[in-house]
Every structure is written in structure tokens, then in C-alpha cells.
């Protein structure tokens, strides 16, 4: 079986000119391909495999959300020569808010990574994007993780930063066929310049309070001393697929497949950093 | 139906510039990988630089690296190359290209660039 | 000097089949990036002839051909016709230039 053989990063890897072509191994019959697309409300970038791959043929779309960072995952496995090519690779630009009043800054700024390499997602030196409120939800959170893409062999991964809605979220995260998006939030503006080694504790648990030995008393009984149950502590949450995973498209949507004659089809794309909408 | 246009091509001495620019039409052009391609007289073809669908991720030929740079305005559909300390070697037809099934499927009809003292 | 080679030159006669080759090395079609072969008729702009190693864009006759194995490729031309005197150029990635890099191209003409 000869496969299409490429990885991308945000833009690079699989553009048409640097499409490679791979004899697979005796055994192997099938050639797989997987886009995952990732949309915060500043902008959009994929990363995708092709290559030999394994298992049985077939078709495997997925949509998640991690705090409203949006994913979308298609996973696609055939069984000729040269099929996995079908997928389109390119995350479209994200539509600029046409009324910019319509979604004022909320005050919040957060280092933003949509597409940037591990190097230039380091410390202070993304840019810094002002949060604003978008879909009927409060974007006052930053965010920093990963995004990973395993298939064929290879695993592809991406860091991930900007405005979600939970300000406190610790190593949370996503998964779908082959697809993990994880990472941590904090309060407060350009808070996500590094959270790779965050701690569970949050503003909303109450501290530690030293409390004053017990009054000496004539009745002997055994105290015991609980803190109160009115800020429970907040359960870290698991995977989240949507409520309906099937076929399920970001806001903006991920396109299936660009038509021959109008779109090239397999153009690498991440987009810039423009706001959303809807 | 898609269309590049090249303009911006002329007369130009040693050390001097230039700004090509290529109208794109027909297609969606924020989706597309695009490059400049250029040839001699009488000579074949050479690939000068390749800008991705989103302008961040920019190849060069060695031969132009450092003197030219590829740019895009994604909203107004068009792809630039300036060209700086032009030499006489850098004489040439400039031909926008499409990347688009596997390979640079459409060409625009090219721009004459004549570096001369 | 062409990263790609093939021969200058080539001819036949109306009906004859045509072979033209280009040698590359392990950096580009070697390395298994795929091939395209453009077509450019005097006085215009190049235009993609075969694509993908083998495959036609639309359009393009079936008289053209293209095949690859190891480090070269070759495009193929049955039923010769006048209006097929052009330069013919390969194409494909190079990894040690990080670009496409073209053959040096070859004339062909169309004898008698």
C-alpha cells in the first residue's frame, strides 16, 4: 500500500508542493489522516498526520470544548493507494466582529498562542490579547496547554494560550480519537505565562486557619474540629465531549472538503489573530 | 474563474527596488499557499519564495534571501514582493503562482523586471 | 546549474511517443516528495500539465503520462501533435533548499 506521508504544524508540513509519497510496511493496510482544528475567540490553526496507518477503514469526527477553547477532530482511514488526501487542512480565518462595540475588552488581557511554535509561545513573548465576552458566556480567564495529534506513528503538538471562560481550571483537559487538548487557567490579566506546574489550590478554597486550642472544659468528650462546607472544593473536571460529538462543527465550522475547482484542497492555514462574532 | 495579475515589473538600475504585486480572484485566496516563480530570458524556470495561507510560514530561494520579501493582504486578495538591491542576474519574468491540487496549478501571465545600468 | 536534470532537447513526428526524463537526487525525489511536470508554450506562462507523480488536471489529454521510480521521473507523450512543441519542466520539493526546485527543462519539437 503507498500512502500520502506529511505533518503538520499550524501551516507548515503538508502543503501540496511538500506532499510525500511512503510505501507502507507488509501488513499495514490502511492510510490514515487526522486534522485536529483548535478555535479560541482570537483565532484559529490546525494541526494534522498522514501516513500508513492501522486498524480497519472508516471515519471518526469529533467536537470538543475545554473551557470555550473549541476543538474539532476528524480522523479518516481508507484502504487504497493514495486515498488519504480528502480532508481539508486549512483552518479558515476567523470573521473580525463586525461591531467591534458589539464585544468591548472586558478588562481581561491574556498571552495568546494560535499556531505559534513552542519557541515563540515561551514566558512574556506572545502577544497579548484583550478578552472580551462572546456567545453569551464570560471569557475573564487566561489559559495555557497543549494541543496533541497522534496517528501513524506520529505524534504532532502544539502549545496553546488565550481567553477561555474558567478562571481556575488546573491540568484539565479534552480527548478525542487520537486528540488531547490540555492545560490550566488562571485569574487575572497576562496570569498564563506559565502554568505547566500550577497547583490544585484556587481562590476558592478557603485557607488553612491555625485555630486556637480548645477552652479547657469539665465535660471530657471528644472534639472534632470541621472546616465549613460552604466553598466545597471545586472537582477537577474530565474529558467533556459535546453533547452531540457525531459530525459536530466549531462556531465558525471546519470545512469537510474544498471543492477541485475552487479551494486547494490541501493548503496548510492557521489563522490569524481576528476575533469571532458569533 | 481564477485569475492572478502581475504588476509592478520595469526598469530598474543595479541596487535599486521594486514592488510586485499580484491581484488573485476567483478563489479563495486566505486558503491559499502562493509563491513567485521567475524566469530569465531565454532561460527555465526558478522558484524565488512561497508565503503560506496565512503569511506565517515564508520559504525563499537562496539566491534572493535577504534582498526580497513576500507579504499578503489576505483582505484585499494580494500577494507582494518587494525586492531590494536588485542585480542584473535578478532580470526576469515574475510569475505569481496558486498552489492549489498538489502543485502550482494556475500562473498569472507574469511581469518583466529589467535590471540595467 | 538545475537541481533537477533533464535533457535540453527532444523531438519527434506527428503520432511518434516522447519520453521525457528528470533525475533528482535523495533530497527531493528520492526523499519521496511527489512530482509534477508543467507545460509552457512559447510566449506563455507555465501551466501544470501532470501532478502528483501521474495524474491529470482536468482538461489535460490522456495522451500525457507521468510515472516515477527511485530518484526520477519521466513524462510521456503519445500520439505526438503539432500543438505539443513546448518546454516541459519537472518539479518537486527539495529538502535541502526548503522550496520546490525546477528541471532545467526540455524543448521539444515537433519534426515534419
Known amino acids: 500500500l503507498e500512502c500520502y506521508s506529511c505533518v503538520q504544524k499550524a501551516d507548515d508540513g503538508c502543503s501540496p508542493n511538500k506532499m510525500k509519497t511512503v510505501k507502507c510496511a507488509p501488513g499495514v493496510d490502511v492510510c490514515t489522516e487526522a486534522v485536529g482544528a483548535v478555535e479560541t475567540i482570537h483565532g484559529q490553526f490546525s494541526l494534522a498526520v498522514r501516513g500508513c496507518g492501522s486498524g480497519l477503514p472508516g471515519k471518526n469526527d469529533r467536537g470538543l470544548d475545554l473551557h470555550g477553547l473549541l476543538a474539532f477532530i476528524q480522523l479518516q482511514q481508507c484502504a487504497q493507494d493514495r486515498c488519504n488526501a480528502k480532508l481539508n487542512l486549512t483552518s479558515r480565518a476567523l470573521d473580525p466582529a463586525g461591531n467591534e462595540s458589539a464585544y468591548p475588552p472586558n478588562g481581561v488581557e491574556c498571552y495568546s498562542c494560535v499556531g505559534l511554535s513552542r519557541e515563540a509561545c515561551q514566558g512574556t513573548s506572545p502577544p497579548v490579547v484583550s478578552c472580551y465576552n462572546a456567545s453569551d458566556h464570560v471569557y475573564k480567564g487566561c489559559f495555557d496547554g497543549n494541543v496533541t495529534l497522534t496517528a501513524a506513528n506520529v505524534t504532532v503538538s502544539l502549545p496553546v494560550r488565550g481567553c477561555v471562560q474558567d478562571e481556575f481550571c488546573t491540568r484539565d483537559g479534552v480527548t478525542g480519537p487520537g486528540f488531547t487538548l490540555s492545560g490550566s487557567c488562571c485569574q487575572g490579566s497576562r496570569c498564563n505565562s506559565d502554568l505547566r506546574n500550577k497547583t490544585y489550590f484556587s481562590p476558592r478554597i478557603p485557607p488553612l486557619v491555625r485555630l486556637p486550642p480548645p477552652e479547657p472544659t469539665t465535660v471530657a468528650s471528644t472534639t472534632s474540629v470541621t472546616t465549613s462546607t460552604s466553598a466545597p472544593v471545586r472537582p477537577t473536571s474530565t474529558t467533556k465531549p459535546m453533547p452531540a460529538p457525531t459530525s459536530q462543527t466549531p462556531r465558525q465550522g471546519v470545512e469537510h472538503e474544498a471543492s477541485r475547482d475552487e479551494e486547494p484542497r490541501l493548503t496548510g492555514g492557521a489563522a490569524g489573530h481576528q476575533d469571532r462574532s458569533n | 474563474e481564477v485569475q492572478l495579475l502581475e504588476s509592478g515589473g520595469g526598469l530598474v538600475q543595479p541596487g535599486g527596488s521594486l514592488r510586485l504585486s499580484c491581484a488573485a480572484s476567483g478563489f479563495t485566496f486566505s486558503n491559499a499557499w502562493m509563491s513567485w516563480v521567475r524566469q530569465a530570458p531565454g532561460k527555465g524556470l526558478e522558484w524565488v519564495s512561497y508565503?503560506?495561507?496565512?503569511?506565517?510560514?515564508?520559504y525563499y530561494a537562496d539566491s534572493v534571501k535577504g534582498r526580497f520579501t513576500i507579504s499578503r493582504d489576505n483582505s484585499k486578495n494580494t500577494l507582494y514582493l518587494q525586492m531590494n538591491s536588485l542585480r542584473a542576474e535578478d532580470t526576469a519574468v515574475y510569475y505569481c503562482?496558486?498552489?492549489?491540487?498538489?502543485?502550482?496549478?494556475?500562473w498569472g501571465q507574469g511581469t518583466l523586471v529589467t535590471v540595467t545600468s | 546549474q538545475s537541481v533537477l536534470t533533464q535533457p535540453p532537447s527532444a523531438s519527434g513526428t506527428p503520432g511518434q511517443r516522447v519520453t521525457i526524463s528528470c533525475s533528482g537526487s535523495s533530497s527531493n525525489i528520492g526523499a519521496g516528495y511527489v512530482v509534477h511536470w508543467y507545460q509552457q508554450l512559447p510566449g506563455t506562462a507555465p501551466k501544470l500539465l501532470i501532478y502528483?507523480?501521474?495524474k491529470r488536471p482536468s482538461g489535460v489529454p490522456d495522451r500525457f503520462s507521468g510515472s516515477k521510480s527511485g530518484t526520477s521521473a519521466s513524462l510521456a507523450i503519445s500520439g505526438l501533435r503539432s500543438e505539443d512543441e513546448a518546454d516541459y519542466y519537472c518539479a518537486a520539493w527539495d529538502d535541502r533548499l526548503n522550496g520546490p526546485v525546477f528541471g532545467g527543462g526540455t524543448k521539444l519539437t515537433v519534426l515534419g
Open positions: 508565503i503560506s495561507s496565512s503569511g506565517s510560514t515564508i
Open positions: 502528483d507523480n501521474n
Open positions: 503562482a496558486r498552489e492549489g491540487l498538489w502543485a502550482f496549478d494556475y
